[in-house]
């Protein structure tokens, strides 16, 4: 016999300083008059009164005079609350209590957000830089909410996760300034990008800095490799570039070239005594013999596997000696997600359904994002699991549990963080009762 009070299941997202409507409705019976209505809005956790309507009259705002009802719509069952000039402190759960003869209540969540500014970048030290110097790059973004995630990447889009320190500072209004510090050892040159992501707005603010240091004079052989990781798709061939500058009169008889795994020192390939000594690495490596005399010591790695990922060091010795390490980042695209629904027939609003999004044979592990038809992120009741096969590729399965509304679209986005490849799948559930997949 209770009164059914309806509110949106998903949080209401409001930007700081704007107005928000917390929707709440009930179904008035025939002959209903406002004199019968008791309506109370209060903060769910603290029970603080926000706004009320009783004895046929709007009792006004008890919440900083920033709330209002919709008086012309109350008689039709619209008990929504307007909250003006939203502040961070307003965030939380609001309960709508409706009493006529029977009584009902429901809680609606307010999620406050504020976009972050375009990041500013600073460099320390910022002059007389040479390869091998350690520099500190600071990325700062201001006046956002809620806390930001900060991602660093190099010029090829490869994530930089080591030696990153991120801190937040809250101001009196509850907005955040985020400061992220990246410490890097400079290569020949490099671009460093900082991305500040607002997790509610899914807003990304980017900035980057490109550093071209001066050459360092040295007696050693200068060995050059790409500063950024080489990204290779599983099953394809990859070239790990390495070069040196041969002096006039240089002959291959003088050259000792060794490629090895940086961490384990396992021999990969070598050229000594004027001859290619061949592959010591599963017979999948080769040099470029016609280019060696011009200083091209690059290594070709065939049929790349996940297990190949890592750092390879190129050692060059003529009279002097030099070495440099190049990183191989392996990747594999994820398949278009397949979507399944359980239960998948006779569905009605209010039913709890499990939507599974599966994407296969990718690398590295995927991030999975869910959102509704309006593009609002769905983060609650999501369980994501990864399964690795014998080749080291991943299958990702993400399960979303939702209570159905009258209709709805649920989208799953599987992101490969290295390839920045997004694979999408979605399911639209409409009608009442409904069946999935829809019958022809």
């Amino acid at each position: 016999g209770a009164l059914e009070v309806q509110v949106p299941e998903d949080p209401v997202v409001a930007l700081v300083g704007t107005d928000a409507t917390l929707c709440c409705s009930f179904s008035p019976e025939p002959g209903f008059s406002l004199a019968q209505l008791n309506l109370i809005w209060q903060l769910t956790d603290t029970k603080q009164l926000v706004h009320s309507f009783a004895e046929g009259q709007d009792q006004g705002s008890a919440y900083a005079n920033r709330t209002a009802l919709f008086p012309d719509l109350l008689a039709q069952g619209n008990a929504s609350l307007r909250l003006q000039r939203v502040r961070v402190a307003d965030e939380g759960s609001f309960t709508c209590f409706v009493s006529i003869r029977d009584f009902g209540s429901a809680a609606v969540s307010l999620q406050v957000a504020a976009p972050y500014s375009k990041p500013s970048m600073t460099l320390e030290p910022n002059k007389d830089l040479r390869p091998g110097d350690t520099v500190t790059i600071t990325c700062s973004s201001y006046q956002g909410y809620p806390e930001a995630e900060v991602f660093w990447q190099d010029g090829q889009g490869v994530p930089l996760t080591g030696n990153v320190t991120t801190s937040q500072m809250a101001n009196e209004q509850g907005l955040f300034d985020v400061h992220s510090i990246l410490r890097v050892v400079l290569g020949a040159n490099g671009t460093y990008s900082c991305l500040v992501r607002n997790p509610v707005l899914q807003q990304d603010a980017h900035s980057s800095v490109t550093i071209t240091p001066q050459r360092s004079p040295t007696g050693a052989v200068e060995v050059q490799v790409p500063e950024d990781p080489v990204v290779a798709l599983v099953g394809t061939d990859a070239t790990l570039r390495c070069s040196f500058s041969p002096e006039p009169g240089f002959s291959l008889a003088q050259l000792n070239l060794i490629w090895q795994l940086t961490d384990t020192k396992q021999l990969v390939h070598s050229f000594t005594e004027g001859r290619d000594q061949g592959s010591a690495y599963a017979n999948r490596t080769a040099l470029f013999p016609d280019l060696l005399a011009q200083g091209n010591a690059s290594l070709r790695l065939q049929r790349v596997r996940v297990a190949d990922e890592g750092s390879f060091t190129c050692f060059v010795s003529i009279r002097d000696f030099g070495s440099a390490a190049v990183s191989l980042q392996v990747a594999a695209p994820y398949s278009k997600p397949s979507m399944t629904l359980e239960p998948n027939k006779d569905l009605r609003p209010g039913d709890t359904v499990t939507i599974t999004c599966s994407s296969y044979r990718g690398y590295p592990e995927a991030e999975v994002f869910w959102q509704d038809g309006q593009g609002v992120p769905l983060t609650g009741n999501v369980t994501t699991s990864q399964m690795a096969n014998e080749q080291g590729l991943f299958d990702v399965h993400s399960v979303l549990r939702v209570v159905l509304g009258a209709n709805g679209t649920y989208s799953c986005l599987v992101r490969n963080p290295v390839l920045q490849q997004d694979a999408h799948g979605s399911v639209t559930i409409t009608g009442q009762p409904m069946t999935f997949p829809p019958e022809a």
């Epitope: 759960s93 809250a170 983060t379």
Partner: antibody, heavy 121, light 108 residues
Amino acid sequence: DVQLVESGGGVVRPGESLRLSCAASGFTFSNYAMNWVRQAPGEGLEWVSRINYKGYNITYYADSVKGRFTISRDNSKNTLYLQMNSLRAEDTAVYYCAKSGSNSNNFFDYWGLGTLVTVSS
Amino acid sequence: EIVLTQSPGTLSLSPGERATLSCRASQTVGSKLAWYQQKPGQAPRLLIYGASTRATDIPDRFSGSGSGTEFTLTISSLQSEDFAVYYCQQYINWPPLSFGGGTKVEIK
């Protein structure tokens, strides 16, 4: 009434692992950032880790535990966790679960009673 | 990292006396400072947040003041249950969310 109840403490050897849990009730758990704070015997309070609200899983750690401890939360179970790996003698302390006043005001308005972790060979 | 320094380390007073505890921050924390009370064998309890706002159910003999880098917790008339250790904590900037070293208020 807000309640935070920690569990999972005990005696372990250096290098071993332990997982602490904190069961929360009396408030909308997912709407609040949560923290672990520890107190070594006879010492002051030391903040250990924080996880922000909802499902955003933005986490922070004290330098002393970074890379060894992992904070997580299960909003469906109203539970906060602290996975502690590679434990050291200096990790011996009472570990408190503490609720942030809000996501932007990280004072600790409610605390659990604590669970004792002893790392000893 | 913001360092909080509490003084004195120990305060010896009699019931009924006024206690004044100090907390100094190494850089400004605005008004984002909290005070806690901890009795032996118990969890800490929030007394003050926002430098001067009393938490729920905290008696009005406890008051906080200050902003920026200098803060004070005052207990106007000590009761027997007020003898405990008091900590300040900043929450303007993290990580870390730092605490002061504590001030012990003991019976003279």
